[in-house]
């Protein structure tokens, strides 16, 4: 069965940014990929990010950068602008659409007691659906 | 077809406050940002904030904050954009458009808004 | 902000002439670029995305390129219906738009 694995990380030289990890275990190919933070988009969470393997991609702030770092998974670079987004209690999700698998999302978010540089386990949820 | 349907223009006097809306249709409301842009006459474009629809949202160009209030109502797939305490440089058409992976694909018709006493 | 400076506020030109406008960030916006085009009284229209995409439903006589902080909109056929202004705009970190360039007949 296929897997999605997040991983938030609080960057150690900067307190403010945060990067989420993402990554889909299974067969076939990739199509999109949708990042969402409060919960998964179209549940009441807000799009940050989307990533097309050969359109490029597409971010909204508080995103700064959405990357491919394999073929499937991805990073996405966010700037806590303070008080307004207070990403340290925020779930985060990601959701991998293949073919021809279909959807598969999961979230995760960064661990109450978590030091700079650490991050949550690469574990998926397995609590959220495949469509 | 997709649609952004604004509301019609709007002549006020200095000092108050007007609400625009852009009611949309032909596609998955929630799914989308709604983009507002300022262009006065003759001028460029402008950015005045963002609002995600499924979840409200909502992100401004610094410009415009506390000029400009955002916001949604999903039942009537209607955003709203209020802009407070106008004086004649907020004299401008407003448009609302769909900010999708594409950037801006679909763009309301605009609304004029006259700052004149 | 990232500024989007479009040097060229008026352009002249005749019909079936190829036309290049270009649009220069401030900072690196990788390919996060869209170009619209506006006629009076009209609303924008997207023509472009991720810098050199296509949008459905334009004509191929128009394409984008460039990356980073250099960009360039070509109308390699130009027509008359093409007369209008032309927008950069950047999506990279928040929106901001270029002045436009407004494209005349000579």
């Known amino acids: 069965t296929p897997e999605v694995w997040v991983q938030v990380q609080m960057e150690a030289t900067e307190l403010s940014s945060f990067t989420v990890h993402c990554g889909f275990l299974g067969p076939g190919s990739i199509s999109l990929v949708t990042v969402s933070w409060g919960g998964p988009d179209g549940a009441g969470g807000t799009k940050l990010a989307v990533l097309h393997p050969e359109l490029g991609t597409r971010q909204w702030a508080p995103a700064r950068q959405a990357r491919w770092e394999t073929q499937s998974s991805i990073s996405l670079a966010l700037e806590d602008s303070g008080a307004s987004s207070p990403f340290a209690n925020t779930t985060f999700c990601c959701k991998f659409a293949s073919f021809p698998e279909g959807s598969w999302e999961s979230c995760g978010s960064l661990p109450p007691s978590s030091d700079p540089g650490l991050s949550a386990p690469p574990t998926p949820v397995p609590i959220l659906r495949a469509d | 077809q997709i649609q952004l349907q604004q509301s019609g223009p709007e002549l006020v006097k200095p000092g108050a406050s007007v609400k625009i809306s852009c009611k949309a249709s032909g596609y998955t409301f929630t799914d989308y940002y709604i983009a507002w842009v300022k262009q006065r006459p003759g001028q460029g474009l402008e950015w005045i904030g963002w609002?995600?629809?499924?979840?409200?949202?909502?992100m401004y160009n610094e410009n415009f904050k506390g000029k400009a209030t955002l916001t949604v109502d999903t039942s009537s797939s209607t955003a709203y954009m209020q802009l407070s305490s106008l004086t004649s440089e907020d004299s401008a058409v407003y448009f609302c458009?769909?900010?999708?992976?594409?950037?801006?694909?679909?763009w309301g018709q605009g609304t004029s808004v006259t700052v004149s006493s | 902000d990232i500024v989007m400076t479009q040097s060229q506020k008026f352009m002249s030109t005749t019909v079936g002439d190829r036309v290049s406008i270009t649009c220069k960030a401030s900072?690196?916006?990788?390919?996060?670029v869209a170009w619209y085009q506006q006629k009076p009284g009209q609303s924008p229209k997207l023509l472009i995305y991720?810098?050199?995409n296509r949008y459905t439903g334009v004509p191929d006589r128009f394409t984008g390129s460039g990356s980073g902080t250099d960009f360039t909109l070509t109308i390699s056929n130009m027509q008359s219906e093409d007369l209008a202004d032309y927008f950069c705009?950047?999506?990279?970190?928040?929106?901001?738009f270029g002045a436009g360039t407004k494209l005349e007949l000579k």
């Open positions: 458009a769909r900010d999708s992976f594409y950037a801006m694909d679909y």
């Open positions: 609002i995600y629809l499924g979840s409200g949202h909502t």
């Open positions: 705009q950047q999506y990279s970190t928040y929106l901001t």
């Open positions: 991720s810098a050199s």
């Open positions: 900072q690196n916006v990788g390919t996060a």
